[in-house]
């Protein structure tokens, strides 16, 4: 008969035979034969394989290097890689999170739209009319100008995106 040219899911073709792939968490030691099943062995400590595979070596777990501002978010298993994240105040430079940078601060005139996480930087937005920010901050949002009217005061100095309004007493000489 014709040897197989394709195999079922979780199998692979070798020497005209369909062999079982090794399950996640195990590596290939020897291919199946006509009379024997594929031989697989569990990955060692600090190793993993996350798919059905025919790999002869397991992958090393990612190292979360504290010198790069990294720490372990989720410990790896024989079937999953370690997930790194950044120390407080830092965020990843890429999706793979191989290094960290300090969270960006929003300059005066800008406020925090979205606070940074371990994997995303601060998102700043310009303070719209009626709002201001007079500090460089990674946490402060734009604050609304003070409402002089509610304090029975009048605006003595208009506010900007960087400064609050200055309120003062009403002019009592005015009719």
């Amino acid at each position: 008969p014709e040897p197989p040219t394709a195999c079922r899911e979780k199998q692979y073709l070798i020497n005209s035979q369909c062999c079982s792939l090794c399950q996640p968490g195990q590596k290939l030691v020897s291919d199946c034969t006509e009379f024997t099943e594929t031989e697989c062995l569990p990955c060692g400590e600090s190793e993993f394989l996350d798919t059905w595979n025919r790999e002869t070596h397991c992958h090393q777990h990612k190292y979360c290097d504290p010198n790069l501002g990294l720490r372990v978010q989720q410990k790896g298993t024989s079937e999953t890689d370690t997930i790194c994240t950044c120390e407080e105040g830092w965020h990843c430079t890429s999706e793979a999170c191989e290094s960290c940078v300090l969270h960006r601060s929003c300059s005066p005139g800008f406020g925090v739209k979205q606070i940074a996480t371990g994997v995303s930087d601060t998102i700043c937005e310009p303070c719209p009319v009626g709002f201001f920010s007079n500090v460089s901050s990674a946490f402060e949002k734009c604050h609304p100008w003070t409402s002089c009217e509610t304090k029975d005061l009048v605006v003595q100095q208009a506010g900007t995106n960087k400064t609050d309004v200055v309120c003062g007493p009403q002019d009592r000489l005015r009719a």
Epitope: F35, T36, E37
Partner: antibody
């Protein structure tokens, strides 16, 4: 009932030939690998060879001690296995068993055996 | 070829005894190890395949264990019908090879 019955054994001179037969019943003969195993008087078991099933093209494998001298064949229409033995030697003297070879990749084994037929090679 | 060494070659035991037969392969056979029982003048009979799986109809007093190169057949409580010769056989690599046999005799 699953059964294997050998025949054809006897006395033969060194250098001579003999053909053994094994009649199978009680199972779908063409689905199985079939084997010959021999046992010299008072000794252990020795695998001689096998013939694969229909799905695997009825190809054969032999032990080094008989390769080129012995031929295994089968007639699936008659449910019969054969062992053609040529250039026989004194050391081929043994009881010859026909055996069904079964199993999966989680382990193959000789699960059905015939009663055996004695082959004596002597002058 | 893979050599199969059985020990002991013979043993004497009484009915009710626990009997252990060992089989050592010359290389790792990954549990592809079968056991057969043979009585005088009869054909061998399959007892256990793939190290520990009993063939249908085989009494539970027969059990197999082992891994790598070392395997064991145990008869937990020897019965009169168990006096016979026992052979191991590796099914990992051609040519299939058998152990030399262990003859279990009545003490």
């Amino acid at each position: 009932e699953v059964q294997l019955v050998e025949s054809g054994g006897g006395l033969v001179q060194p250098g001579g030939s003999l053909r053994l037969s094994c009649a199978a019943s009680g199972f779908t003969f063409s689905d199985y690998y079939m084997s010959w195993v021999r046992q010299a008087p008072g000794k252990g078991l020795e695998w001689v060879g096998f013939i694969r099933n229909k799905a695997n093209g009825y190809t054969t494998e032999y032990a080094a001690s008989v390769k080129g001298r012995f031929t295994i064949s089968r007639d699936n229409s008659k449910n019969t296995l054969y062992l053609q033995m040529n250039s026989l030697r004194a050391e081929d003297t043994a009881v010859y068993y026909c055996a069904r070879y079964g199993g999966l990749r989680q382990g193959w084994y000789f699960d059905v055996w015939g009663q055996g037929t004695l082959v004596t090679v002597s002058s | 070829d893979i050599q199969m060494t059985q020990s002991p070659s013979s043993l004497s035991a009484s009915v009710g005894d626990r009997v252990t037969i060992t089989c050592r392969a010359s290389q790792d056979i990954r549990n592809y190890l079968n056991w057969y029982q043979q009585k005088p003048g009869k054909a061998p009979k399959l007892l256990i395949y793939y190290t520990s799986r009993r063939d249908s109809g085989v009494p539970s007093r027969f059990s197999g264990s082992g891994s790598g190169t070392d395997y064991t057949l145990t008869i937990s409580s020897l019965q009169p019908e168990d006096f016979a010769t026992y052979f191991c056989q590796q099914g990992k690599t051609l040519p299939w090879t058998f152990g030399g046999g262990t003859k279990v005799e009545i003490k």
